[in-house]
């Protein structure tokens, strides 16, 4: 059976077959002795009762209110009520594209990999048994497929593929012809797979510290979304409580990795905080990678070469 | 391969404790050292963020802010990791998931949610 409508804000676009499905529908045995009213209110009327008298493209069932179509003065609020159980929606009827196959507002937005496993399959299952015939377009173009019930796409995707496609079902009801469209806007992407994620910047780094002051060691790192960073320090002398590992930060990169940066705070620094590595460890399925800050007193700075210093 | 799961999540009152049980299958669970993750409902992405840590020696480590209230420890035997919360505040609430520390990681587990709320 078609579920329910549950979302509370609805578009639809003029002209069109639509329905609205409350969603205590499950309680048949109730339903049919119990009263039930479909009410509709806009700016200027408060809570009009329907019924098919109100209009001759609405048709009233157990669960569902049918427009057949429905039209811009249908936008407002709905409203069933049964016993004492009430469910509303604001229905927002939008104007149809005249010189398109489709409406852009009424677009949904897929992503496929290139290379990944590409489907579009034309299926409306409320309406399934008064669709004549579907058909699917790309582009507006209509595409010569072998089922004229469910046109179907499978395929790997090619970057040729992207693409509006438009799933048109068209059906008859109390002899007249409307159509139904679902349209996808499907873009092809490089492939997205996983990346060994790599710590940026030297695998040694001295930094230069003076006794009682704070430092802040910042470890960066490109990594994939399911990847972790922290901070490995004080496993064998139980936890210091002047060393602090700060919130990691995540910034997306365009090509969809993950840029990450961890901060290590040491406040107050001491003897026991000189001359022991503290290592910054990015992980994956894949591996890990690690990159180690020593520190070092101001003082001691002309015992090691200018270069493998981090300031 | 190996199978992580994650149980004993739940909605709990600020104040209140639980505790997170992850068993660990098909793996050589003693020599590795392991962590209990969480996932922040607006973490961007998946980041999750190590909170406890025990090495294969039994030597445990904390994030700052659970640090005194969450603790963390294992049982070889039956290749498991506990990590017990108690005096849990709103900020704790997230999907908690174990995984290795300080190695490869394992492929992830479904986790366990935590909600802390009144």
């Known amino acids: 059976a078609e579920s329910c409508t549950s979302r509370p804000h609805i578009t639809v676009v003029e002209g069109e077959p639509f329905y609205l499905k409350h969603c205590s529908c499950s309680l048949a045995h109730e339903i049919e002795t119990t009263t039930k009213s479909w009410y509709k209110s806009s700016g200027s009327q408060e809570h009009v009762e329907l019924n098919p008298r109100s209009s001759s493209r609405i048709a009233l069932h157990d669960c569902v209110l049918e427009f057949w179509p429905v039209e811009l003065n249908d936008t407002g609020s709905y409203f069933f009520q049964m016993k004492n159980y009430t469910q509303k929606w604001k229905l927002n009827v939008i104007r149809r594209n005249k010189h398109s196959c489709f409406t852009e507002r009424q677009v949904t937005s897929k992503i496929v990999e290139v290379k990944k496993f590409f489907q579009i399959t034309c299926e409306n299952s409320y309406y399934q048994t008064l669709v004549n015939s579907t058909s699917l377009y790309k582009n507006c173009k209509k595409l010569l497929l072998e089922n004229n019930k469910n046109p179907t796409i499978k395929k790997n995707a090619e970057f040729e593929d992207q693409g509006y496609y438009s799933c048109v079902h068209f059906l008859h009801h109390n002899g007249k012809l409307f159509n139904i469209t679902k349209t996808f806007n499907i873009t092809i992407v490089e492939d997205r797979s996983n990346i060994v994620p790599v710590l940026l910047g030297p695998k040694l780094n001295h930094v230069a510290v003076e006794l009682g002051k704070n430092v802040r060691l910042n470890c960066s790192a490109l990594l994939n979304e399911e990847d972790v960073i922290y901070w490995m320090f004080g496993e064998e002398n139980g936890s210091d409580p002047n060393i602090h590992e700060e919130k990691e930060m995540r910034i997306m990169t365009p090509e969809g990795k993950w840029h990450a940066s961890k901060v290590l705070r040491i406040e107050n620094i001491g003897e026991s905080n000189l001359n022991v590595l503290y290592n910054c460890t990015v992980a994956s399925t894949g591996g890990t990678d690690t990159k180690s800050f020593i520190l070092v007193r101001k003082a001691d700075m002309a015992d090691i070469p200018g270069h493998v210093f981090t300031r | 391969e190996v199978q992580l799961v994650e149980s004993g999540g739940g909605l709990v009152q600020p104040g209140g404790s639980l505790r997170l049980s992850c068993v660990a299958s098909g793996s050589i669970f003693s020599i590795n050292g392991m962590g209990w993750y969480r996932q922040a409902p607006q973490a961007p992405g998946k980041q999750r963020e190590l909170?406890?840590?025990?090495?294969?020696?039994?030597?445990?480590i904390y994030a700052t802010s659970v640090k005194g209230r969450f603790t963390i420890s294992r049982d070889n035997a039956k290749n498991t990791v506990y990590l017990q919360m108690d005096n849990l505040k709103p900020d704790d609430t997230a999907v908690y998931y174990c995984?290795?520390?300080?190695?490869?990681?394992?492929?992830w587990g479904q986790g366990t949610q935590v909600t802390v709320s009144s």
């Open positions: 909170v406890a840590r025990i090495t294969s020696g039994g030597s445990t």
């Open positions: 995984n290795i520390y300080g190695g490869a990681l394992w492929p």
